[in-house]
């Protein structure tokens, strides 16, 4: 059986939309499937790599690599999206290309970044972990770390940094899929909202779905002990 909830929820574009949340009900009137997984049920994607889930994550990453920061022209906010999802008239799509990007490193201004921009994250303004020396962030936003400390400045003069961010990574469903959403939408969908991250590639949704002890490598499920838990 299914339990359907419908509600008006604030979405990425800053408008309220009617959203459906469909929950598979437990046949035995017990905990939900997500709760059962958290409690240690024999759920194979938490025990070993699942090809379907792996392909889903790779597909999400490929899309994200090509994303940019969509900044609303009315200063109502910004969100990481694909160019096609960013209004040409009501917003500005900030995407580095050709030689418009910032330098890869302060010691070589000539080599420009082409991957980005990312809403609220920039290698020039991140103090921790700083992109410098032997630890220059790659020219691939899906390999960027989470920035834990920004340079102290109210305004940077960069469109993608001075806007009010409207969406962050949200882990939805038992498949460990990730979407950049508003907090409201994420909570309504019973997802896990990552306040600290800017990109889906920075979070490991399956690790969150599985719970219990974190994977040794967040990319590789290793909870073999589930076989004895349930």
């Amino acid at each position: 059986a299914q339990h359907v909830t419908t509600q008006l929820v604030l979405r990425n574009k800053g408008v309220y939309e009617s959203v459906k949340y469909i929950q598979q009900e437990n046949f035995w009137i017990g905990p939900s499937s997500i709760d059962l997984i958290h409690l240690g049920a024999k759920f194979s994607p938490c025990i070993r790599k699942d090809q379907q889930i792996e392909q889903l994550v790779l597909r999400e990453r490929d899309l994200e690599r090509d994303s940019g920061c969509c900044v609303q022209n009315d200063h109502s906010g910004c969100i990481q999206t694909q160019r096609k999802d960013c209004s040409e008239t009501l917003a500005t799509f900030v995407k580095w290309q050709d030689d418009t990007g910032p330098p890869m490193d302060k010691s070589d201004l000539g080599q420009k970044r082409t991957s980005g921009a990312v809403c609220h994250q920039d290698p020039r303004t991140c103090e921790e972990p700083a992109s410098s020396g032997a630890h220059i962030w790659p020219d691939d936003i899906t390999k960027w770390p989470i920035c834990t400390e920004q340079a102290k400045s109210n305004r940077t003069g960069f469109l993608h940094m001075d806007c009010q961010i409207k969406g962050r990574p949200c882990c939805i469903s038992t498949k460990g899929s990730c979407e950049i959403t508003t907090r409201e939408y994420c909570e309504f969908m019973h997802g896990y909202f990552h306040e600290e991250a800017t990109l889906c590639s920075q979070v490991h949704c399956l690790d969150k779905v599985c719970g219990l002890l974190p994977f040794l490598n967040p990319e590789v499920p290793d909870q073999f002990y589930r076989l004895w838990l349930s």
């Epitope: 418009t100 000539g110 020396g133 340079a151 940077t156 003069g157």
Partner: antibody, heavy 120, light 107 residues
Framework: QVTLKESGPGILQPSQTLSLTCSFS??????????IGWVRQPSGKGLEWLAH???????YNNPVLKSRLTISKDTSKNQVFLRIANVDTPDTATYYC????????????WGQGTSVTVSS | DIVLTQSPATLSVTPGHSVSLSCRAS??????LHWYQKKSHESPRLLIK???QSISGIPSRFSGSGSGTDFTLSINSVETEDFGMYFC?????????FGAGTKLELK
């Protein structure tokens, strides 16, 4: 308030080493993205970027003068130093120290400049 | 090194008139172009960053435009305090380079 002040010998002879000091206040060279650079302007000519040093100790010297330039800092004293070895008459110029940022690569504050004459 | 060519070398203007100063780069520098003003016996002062971004404390009569290799600094209704030298600077690559300057003088 950010201030930078250059000091130097004023006059020196060819083949000598020019030693310049930039004393600054209102900010720290330990702050992320902060840098101090040296720019010179020979009389009636354009500005020339010489060298700079970053908050993390990384340095840059203009390749045209590279072998003659040495830049260093003393963060505890809020000072940056520039040495130009084996000077000659074309090194006669006004030398400025300038604050730069690795976020923008613009000079947001300049010193008043110090005049240096190389003459025998 | 990237060469910046400024024109004209000297511009004579009457207060109240508007002027345009040109800066041309020897190669494309995208939007990595900034403008400075230098008055006699004073240090240079940043006017415009990244082609057209305003700097706090700089009067709104100063504006910038252009991209790639051709850039313009415009002064709408020149005031007596605006006379002096104007330099452009590129930050596309090391070493940072400057134009030779345009001297704005009283006509």
């Amino acid at each position: 308030q950010v201030t930078l002040k250059e000091s130097g010998p004023g006059i020196l002879q060819p083949s000598q080493t020019l030693s310049l000091t930039c004393s600054f206040s209102g900010f720290s060279l330990t702050t992320f993205a902060m840098g101090i650079g040296w720019v010179r302007q020979p009389s009636g000519k354009g500005l020339e970027w010489l060298a700079h040093i970053w908050w993390d100790g990384e340095k840059y010297n203009n390749p045209v003068l590279k072998s003659r330039l040495t830049i260093s800092k003393d963060t505890s004293k809020n000072q940056v130093f520039l040495r130009i070895a084996n000077v000659d008459t074309p090194d006669t110029a006004t030398y400025y120290c300038a604050r730069i940022s690795s976020i923008y690569y613009i000079i947001d504050n300049w010193g008043q400049g110090t005049s240096v004459t190389v003459s025998s | 090194d990237i060469v910046l060519t400024q024109s004209p070398a000297t511009l004579s203007v009457t207060p109240g008139h508007s002027v345009s100063l040109s800066c041309r780069a020897s190669q494309s520098i995208s939007n990595n172009l900034h403008w400075y003003q230098k008055k006699s016996h004073e240090s240079p002062r940043l006017l415009i960053k990244y082609v057209s971004q305003s700097i706090s404390g700089i009067p709104s009569r100063f504006s910038g435009s252009g991209s790639g290799t051709d850039f313009t600094l415009s002064i709408n209704s020149v005031e007596t305090e605006d006379f002096g030298m104007y330099f452009c600077q590129q930050s596309y690559n090391w070493p940072l380079t400057f134009g030779a300057g345009t001297k704005l003088e009283l006509k």
